[in-house]
Interface confidence: low
């Protein structure tokens, strides 16, 4: 449906609060480095002429394209080239490169101070002065660290932000009400960021056909009731939606959001028996509900799947027939049937079926070569099974922490050559893995603890890419989308690697670790380890368990000495000359 | 894209007879089984009747046995509902589904039974 101006129609469908909001988003998603204040400016000059158009459609400029308008209006900012080097150079290029060219410039580590958190007292009194800047400020920061962060998405964290401060700002012991909120909405909003930069990674490293497929697998396991053609509608707007996410396209993303959930509540019937609660929430809390509802019961007659996809004589007609298609129904059939199974283990399956009958379709007897295919299932199926059910138990003796470890060190000896950061910020995400799947049942260990694992390892991925050290990341992050996780674990020991040089400074602490947070300690310590690996590859478990050990009793005792700093320093040198001689340094 | 077009709907007088047709595409029809699921006015998805994908199987929900008749033209791609001695409450919009699960994936058309 084509509108005279697109300003105008987007503005009328999402109200000015949602507009002003989504646009702040995108202007931060693409120029991390600007000020808040500059920004600000910014939306409120694009929000004025939206209303100018929403008065008369017909007025200058307003039949521009959304990108042409934002684009020209980014292309404003005096500071670009000395803030920004060459993504100023996207401004001399025309719609639609132009805006290419800005998602290309995106930075999923951009070099931001972390966000510190003030006391509840400063915090409260900001939220009272001025709600609405808070607010926006909220949006601003979250926006700028995580540049492909669900926008529709951050507008519910926002309205769950606003509550949680307008509830706490009045109750009696604030920072016992407020700050576990904020701990929640922090950690949720880092899962959620993460899970996002997947579905784009998908859509833009692997295309429209990958993303659809996760999502034919992920829509089936949820509605399981759903007919076929049901399922293809929602993946067909499902995808429309995360494309224009991911493609900086944030009204449109929204608008067609809540296009999709409203249809979803008006047709529940035929999609899911457990839609209901949540099409009785307002829109946000509505879309968020949709999107993390449990899978629906399986119906309970479903015919075995052989008749349709191997017993069958006309196999090879249909699938020779549409291709897609027939691929689509029978991931649609295996997804509904398995939701105990992980959506890239499904995906697995489908890329081995897909591959059987392209070699077999072309064979003298089809029906002989492909009757077997189910066969070729059960080592795919296996291998997870088995990894989950060694990891889980290695879990349950060691405790998080000291999973993370172990994960720290398997990692770091396949892949030296990453950063020790980026080493250690993807260790100790594989490492809660345990503690957030291993408490579920056997049915549902596998799609929460790989499904987890595809969106923890496409950080790593997607940090890397930024600046490739390592032919062997490249090489299981590129080739496959659903083999990346069997892809790493297959890797042993680099043994090409060349140990690093011994720093004694890398190995020096100071007294400010003892005010640290428990969880800053614990990084302090796995950073170390993870040094200690680069140094010495081959170390043996137990040689690293030791000078871990004797670290930690040197934080102890140093953290409780009257002179810290001097204990630090002291015993510092004697630690890091006992941890030479353990290791053989 | 999957498309599941239904027609054949109308007024009709109880005891009188009607055909419904489902035109699909997008798909490899002759390839799957298909259903009729109706839907009366303010409740769930009903299952009528399922079809095998060569034609030889059919299935009737009690309420219909006797009275309705699936087919299916694979050569056409269509799938087909004939309904007799209809009764005011086989009032409901009736949808064709691929497979055998009561719901419904496309937009239906509406049998109304009533003197």
């Known amino acids: 449906d084509a509108h005279k101006s697109e300003v105008a129609h987007r503005f009328k469908d999402l109200g000015e609060e949602n507009f002003k909001a989504l646009v702040l988003i995108a202007f931060a998603q693409y120029l991390q480095q600007c000020p808040f204040e500059d920004h600000v400016k910014l939306v409120n000059e694009v929000t004025e002429f939206a209303k100018t158009c929403v008065a008369d459609e017909s007025a200058e400029n307003c039949d521009k394209s959304l990108h042409t308008l934002f684009g020209d209006k980014l292309c404003t900012v005096a500071t670009l080239r000395e803030t920004y080097g060459e993504m100023a150079d996207c401004c001399a290029k025309q719609e639609p490169e132009r805006n290419e060219c800005f998602l290309q410039h995106k930075d999923d580590n951009p070099n931001l101070p972390r966000l510190v958190r003030p006391e509840v007292d400063v915090m409260c009194t900001a939220f009272h002065d001025n709600e609405e800047t808070f607010l926006k400020k909220y949006l601003y920061e979250i926006a700028r660290r995580h540049p492909y962060f669900y926008a529709p998405e951050l507008l519910f964290f926002a309205k769950r932000y606003k509550a949680a401060f307008t509830e706490c700002c009045q109750a009696a012991d604030k920072a016992a009400c407020l700050l576990p909120k904020l701990d929640e909405l922090r950690d949720e909003g880092k899962a959620s960021s993460a899970k996002q930069r997947l579905k784009c990674a998908s859509l833009q490293k692997f295309g429209e056909r990958a993303f659809k497929a996760w999502a034919v697998a992920r829509l089936s396991q949820r509605f399981p009731k759903a007919e076929f053609a049901e399922v293809s509608k929602l993946v067909t707007d499902l995808t429309k939606v995360h494309t224009e996410c991911c493609h900086g396209d944030l009204l449109e993303c929204a608008d067609d959001r809540a296009d999709l959930a409203k249809y979803i509540c008006e047709n529940q019937d035929s999609i899911s028996s457990k839609l209901k609660e949540c099409c009785e929430k307002p829109l946000l809390e509505k879309s968020h509900c949709i999107a993390e509802v449990e899978n629906d019961e399986m119906p309970a007659d479903l015919p075995s799947l052989a008749a349709d996809f191997v017993e069958s004589k006309d196999v090879c007609k249909n699938y020779a027939e549409a291709k897609d298609v027939f691929l689509g129904m029978f991931l649609y059939e295996y997804a509904r049937r398995h939701p105990d199974y992980s959506v890239v283990l499904l995906l697995r399956l489908a890329k081995t079926y897909e591959t059987t009958l392209e070699k077999c379709c072309a064979a003298a007897d089809p029906h002989e070569c492909y009757a077997k295919v189910f066969d070729e299932f059960k080592p795919l199926v296996e291998e997870p099974q088995n990894l989950i059910k060694q990891n889980c138990e290695l879990f349950e003796q060691l405790g998080e922490y000291k999973f993370q470890n172990a994960l720290l060190v398997r990692y770091t000896k396949k892949v030296p050559q990453v950063s020790t950061p980026t080493l250690v910020e993807v260790s100790r995400n594989l490492g809660k893995v345990g503690s957030k799947c291993c408490k579920h049942p056997e049915a549902k260990r596998m799609p929460c603890a790989e499904d987890y694992l595809s969106v923890v390892l496409n950080q790593l991925c997607v940090l890397h890419e930024k600046t490739p050290v390592s032919d062997r990341v490249t090489k299981c992050c590129t080739e496959s989308l659903v083999n990346r996780r069997p892809c790493f674990s297959a890797l042993e020991v680099d043994e090409t690697y060349v140990p690093k040089e011994f720093n004694a400074e890398t190995f020096t602490f100071h007294a400010d670790i003892c005010t640290l947070s428990e969880k800053e300690r614990q990084i302090k310590k796995q950073t170390a380890l993870v040094e200690l690996v680069k140094h010495k590859p081959k170390a043996t478990k137990e040689q690293l368990k030791a000078v871990m050990d004797d670290f930690a009793a040197f934080v102890e005792k140093c953290c409780k000495a009257d002179d810290k700093e001097t204990c630090f320093a002291e015993e510092g040198k004697k630690l890091v000359a006992a941890s030479q001689a353990a290791l053989g340094l | 894209e999957v498309q599941l077009l239904e027609s054949g709907g109308g007024l009709v007088q109880p005891g009188g007879s009607l055909r419904l047709s489902c035109a699909a595409s997008?798909?490899?029809?002759?390839?799957?089984?298909m259903s009729w699921v109706r839907q009366a006015p303010g409740k769930g998805p009903e299952w009528v009747s399922a079809?095998?994908?060569?034609?030889?199987?059919?299935r009737y929900a009690e309420s219909v046995k006797g009275r309705f008749t699936i087919s299916r033209d694979n050569s056409k791609n269509t799938l087909y509902l004939q309904m007799n001695s209809l009764r005011p409450e086989d009032t409901a919009v009736y949808y064709c589904?691929?497979?055998?699960?009561?719901?419904?994936g496309s937009q239906g058309t509406l049998v109304t039974v009533s003197s």
């Open positions: 589904t691929i497979g055998r699960s009561a719901s419904r």
């Open positions: 997008g798909f490899t029809f002759s390839s799957f089984g």
């Open positions: 079809i095998d994908s060569g034609g030889a199987d059919t």
